[in-house]
């Protein structure tokens, strides 16, 4: 028997992936466990193997189809179960009725690039990845810029309250190395959370022209 508290959290990327984390105090180290997804109104079901990510938590990704295919809609409810092997049978360790579009976490933005850089400003663009056509333009973004001598945690957050896949960073210091990250969140979903941060984009502002005021 397993004692202790269990937490089972999943997010849908809005297209064809449900990522789950299962945490269990006093957990079974050498037991094989999996997540099983059973939609209420689809002909398919899906399973993934839970792999350890820390002492007492496991994670896996349910791949529902091709990355950009719309495998679930807002009407679907998916029964998600954690099943662990006990001898010759499987035991249900956790279960939830999962509303995919109430529990969204999109993929991190991709293809970050510097569109134009000057001494004091830099224009950066990006793309969203595997985001449902359902959202239309109703997405928001957060961005942050890493300045020399600071940490990401200290970087102020810039909020873009609409689907705007570019930003113009102002009041930068000439001839200085920066890094930039962005993340995305749909407005839809009670338990929706921010995507992971994008891979950092490194850029350098242009040096100030000699003999000129900057």
């Amino acid at each position: 028997a397993v004692n202790g508290t269990s937490q089972f959290t999943c997010f849908y990327n809005s297209r064809a992936n449900i990522s789950c984390v299962w945490s269990q105090d006093g957990a079974l180290q050498d037991t094989s466990c999996q997540v099983h997804a059973w939609p209420d109104r689809r002909r398919w079901n899906q399973t993934c193997e839970l792999l350890p990510v820390s002492q007492a938590s496991w994670a896996c990704n349910l791949i529902l189809g091709a990355p950009d295919s719309q495998k679930l809609t807002t009407v679907d409810i998916v029964t998600l179960r954690v099943l662990c092997r006990e001898g010759v049978r499987w035991r249900v360790m956790a279960i939830q009725d999962f509303k995919p579009f109430e529990n969204l976490r999109l993929m991190a933005p991709i293809s970050l690039q510097v569109v134009h850089v000057e001494t004091h400003r830099c224009n950066i663009s990006w793309e969203i990845s595997q985001a449902s056509h359902y959202f239309e333009r109703h997405l928001e973004f957060e961005a942050r810029t890493l300045s020399p001598g600071h940490t990401w945690e200290e970087a102020p957050l810039l909020t873009l309250k609409q689907k705007q896949e570019w930003i113009c960073l102002e009041t930068l210091t000439p001839d200085t190395q920066y890094e930039f990250q962005v993340r995305v969140k749909p407005l839809q979903g009670e338990f929706t959370t921010w995507s992971p941060w994008s891979q950092p984009l490194a850029f350098r502002t242009k040096p100030a022209a000699l003999g000129k005021d900057t």
């Epitope: 719309q70 809609t73 807002t74 009407v75 056509h133 359902y134 239309e136 407005l187 839809q188 009670e190």
Partner: antibody
């Protein structure tokens, strides 16, 4: 500019079938959802269903499920709503609208359907 | 299905004054509530999504708020073009349902 232009008014006899068209422009029809909404005289709005042109799926409200069929022709950027076994209480204005699944962002001008013997 | 109840059925307000329209859900719908405006002979127009998010192009005098299952649409200073019927709509439980509407008329 987003536009949804619906076909003209219809007069039908009880038991007949009506088919309304909704020609769209100004957005990618193949990646859109088109909803249909009924507004009967003196009554509120009633959501009937949608077609998801990208996924190729339809959803219908239970109250209309047995009698409504929503289709789309992506070659002409036109959606259709067919309502069968018409009765007098189906006399209403019918709207097509574009949106995500959750709300309706842009609406057609409406098509009046009168059911009378 | 979820029943959406709007109150009052008719609201009489003078131009320049504030109007407060209410929409109550028969069960918890999180923030999945959207507001529309409909003028006579016209199609509805989307105003507010998710209880409080304004749609671009909608004047700033329109705002939304939520307290539990009760949602409020506030028009801070009524203009002549604001007199219309207002509908709320929930998208929490399928099928989506609308309120019966509040008619906002000139006092």
């Amino acid at each position: 500019e987003v536009q949804l232009v619906q076909s003209g008014a219809e007069v039908k006899k009880p038991g007949a079938t009506v088919k309304i068209s909704c020609k769209v422009s100004g957005f990618n029809f193949k990646e859109s959802l088109i909803h249909w909404v009924q507004q009967a005289p003196g009554k509120g709005l009633e959501w009937m269903g949608w077609i998801d042109n990208e996924a190729g799926e339809t959803e219908y409200a239970p109250g209309f499920q047995d009698r409504v069929t929503i289709t789309a022709d992506t070659s002409t950027d036109t959606a259709y709503m067919e309502l069968s076994s018409l009765r007098s209480e189906d006399t209403a204005v019918y709207y097509c609208a574009r949106g995500g699944p959750w709300f309706l962002s842009y609406w057609g001008q409406g098509t009046t359907v009168t059911v009378s013997s | 299905e979820i029943v959406m109840t709007q109150s009052p059925a008719t609201l009489s307000v003078s131009p320049g004054e504030r109007a407060t329209l209410s929409c109550r859900a028969s069960q918890i719908i999180s923030n999945n509530l959207h507001w529309y405006q409909q003028k006579p002979g016209q199609a509805p127009r989307l105003l507010i999504i998710y209880g409080l998010q304004s749609i671009s192009g909608i004047p700033a005098r329109f705002s939304g708020s939520r307290s539990g299952t009760e949602f409020t649409l506030t028009i801070s200073s009524l203009q002549s073009e604001d007199f219309a019927v207002y509908f709320c709509q929930q998208s929490n439980n399928f099928p989506w349902t609308f309120g019966q509407g509040t008619k906002l008329e000139i006092k």
